[in-house]
């Protein structure tokens, strides 16, 4: 009885299509695979950024796999062929591993790359990124930002830079069609007559960096002798009501009475008849139903009642 063996895949490689971190892992079938034509051969693929503790593992019948990586670090991957037990009348047969690596040859020292990169997706409408120049770089250094997300044919360069002292220190992005809930890749590279500049790579999802506008139309309504309902409206823009969390700060007679987080556009407050002044502000944030993270909006304008009996009046501003 001859032992069944299978070769590893051929020409296993990591291909960079120029999407700033979204890479293709691809391979060719092992030689003599047609001996197992009646049988579906599978491949076990393992990959990770160099320095990561854990491998991602995929089992596939395809000859390629695509995923996002951090190009600030190298990438390593390995693959082997799997013959399921149905093909071998016994136990699963595995080939030896084929291995490959990929990294972008770094130019310049790490200090030359941009510092304090910060991106905010204002009101789920306008993306703005800002950065500080690298440490010790000269004024002739200029930085360029490129971005890509699935749906674009190729990486695009920023066309509206924010400048300071003639240097690009930020980018105002155009309208980004169908760009949320998918990885958004950015590279900021640079050029200088003086010395090479290190590139920086960033990946995030736009819905996780949204900073909404503050709520509007704050009102008071007396519900009963000891309850006041605070109400407000969602900010203008594309974010639906179901996506908001709110934080309220209420002051009664110059004392912070309540700070609360709520999911609706109302909050009921217990009060006493002695209350002479009541003020509140609200801010909004995208909630866990619509994103994994977010940025609190600025506080709304303050809405106050003072000097009148709250029981006799609905106050609007």
């Amino acid at each position: 009885d001859t032992e069944i063996k299978v070769n590893p895949p051929q020409d296993f490689e990591i291909v960079d299509p120029g999407y700033l971190g979204y890479l293709y892992l691809q391979w060719q079938p092992p030689l003599s695979l047609d001996h197992f034509k009646e049988c579906t051969v599978e491949y076990e693929l393992k990959y990770r950024n160099i320095g990561s503790e854990t491998w991602k593992t995929i089992i596939t019948k395809n000859l390629h796999y695509k995923d996002g990586f951090d190009l600030n670090k190298g990438i390593e991957a390995k693959i082997h062929t799997l013959l399921p037990w149905q093909c071998t009348n016994g136990s699963e047969v595995q080939s030896s591993w084929a291995e490959t690596t990929y990294w972008i040859s770094p130019q310049g020292i790490p200090e030359t790359k941009v510092q304090d990169m910060d991106c905010v997706y204002y009101n789920w409408q306008y993306l703005l990124c800002s950065w500080k120049p690298g440490i010790g770089v000269l004024l002739d250094t200029n930085y360029n930002l490129f971005y890509w997300y699935e749906g674009l044919d190729h990486a695009l360069q920023c066309v509206d830079y924010i400048k300071a002292d003639g240097q690009n220190i930020g980018c105002r992005f155009p309208y980004l069609e169908a760009s949320d809930y998918k990885d958004f890749y950015i590279c900021v590279n640079g050029s200088s007559e003086n010395k090479p500049i290190r590139s920086s790579y960033f990946t995030f999802q736009l819905q996780n960096i949204v900073k909404p506008l503050p709520p509007v139309y704050l009102t008071f309504t007396r519900e009963s002798s000891c309850e006041i309902k605070l109400k407000w409206s969602i900010p203008l823009g594309p974010i639906p009501a179901r996506c908001f969390d709110y934080e309220i700060e209420i002051r009664e007679d110059d004392t912070t009475l309540v700070t609360a987080t709520v999911e609706n556009e109302t909050y009921t407050l217990k009060t006493t008849n002695e209350t002479r002044q009541l003020c509140f502000v609200v801010r909004s944030k995208v909630n866990i139903y619509c994103s994994d993270d977010g940025i609190w909006s600025e506080w709304s304008d303050k809405q106050c009642w003072e000097g009148e009996d709250l029981s006799k009046k609905t106050l609007l501003r």
Partner: antibody, heavy 118, light 107 residues
């Protein structure tokens, strides 16, 4: 449909260099290895070079190793063969071919004649 | 290098007849053999891979067989458009090598 279109015919002197190109269309170029194969007048086909889909792997026979370089530009779906130190026995029709999943060649270009003559 | 030896060099036949072309490898190449057809003045066209599997669009009168060192291309009924040179190729190991070709002619 799959199409491979090579650059035009070349006449060069011995010792000179030339760079052939092959423009591909009708398939995802970066997913396929590509090869160059040549055929001297009245002779058998002779494999010249192969490059993997991403360009990480290149293969040559001893007869051209060090003189010929196969490259590819996946952004323009173009395959290249740079030939240096050409000799009269390099005279042939050069075909670009797509490598199928088993290293056979499933689609071929129309061929380009390279004549090396003093 | 693996040498691929084809026979016969020339194959005169009549329309509608079956013909076979032989290809012998100088060492074991498993089933890693392809067959190509080159009509006069044209580029090669792929017919068979992995010794016996037809590429799509290839008429079923073409078939391949063999493994190890002995391989055969068979045309069950020759048609006028089959006039060409047929080449075998091994891809079991680099360098990839081709047979010398068999010229199919109509008598």
């Amino acid at each position: 449909q799959v199409k491979l279109v090579e650059s035009g015919a070349e006449v060069v002197k011995p010792g000179a260099s030339v760079k052939l190109s092959c423009k591909a269309s009708g398939f995802t170029f970066s997913s396929y290895g590509m090869s160059w194969v040549r055929q001297a007048p009245g002779q058998r086909l002779e494999w010249v070079a192969t490059i993997s889909g991403g360009g990480s792997y290149t293969y040559y026979p001893e007869s051209v190793k060090g003189r010929f370089t196969i490259t590819r530009d996946n952004s323009t779906s173009t395959l290249y063969l740079e030939m240096r130190s050409l000799r009269s026995d390099d005279t042939a029709v050069y075909y670009c071919a797509r490598r199928d999943l088993r290293s056979a060649m499933d689609y071929w270009g129309q061929g380009t004649l390279v004549t090396v003559s003093s | 290098d693996i040498v691929m030896t084809q026979s016969p060099l020339s194959l005169p036949t009549t329309l509608g007849q079956p013909v076979s072309v032989s290809c012998k490898a100088s060492q074991n190449v498993d089933i890693n053999v392809a067959w190509y057809q080159q009509r006069p003045g044209q580029s090669p066209r792929a017919l068979i891979y992995s010794a016996s599997y037809r590429y799509s669009g290839v008429p079923d009168r073409f078939s391949g067989s063999g493994s190890g060192t002995d391989f055969t291309l068979t045309i069950s009924r020759v048609e006028a458009e089959d006039v060409a040179v047929f080449f075998c190729q091994q891809y079991n190991a680099y360098p990839l090598t081709f047979g010398g070709g068999t010229k199919l002619e109509i008598k």
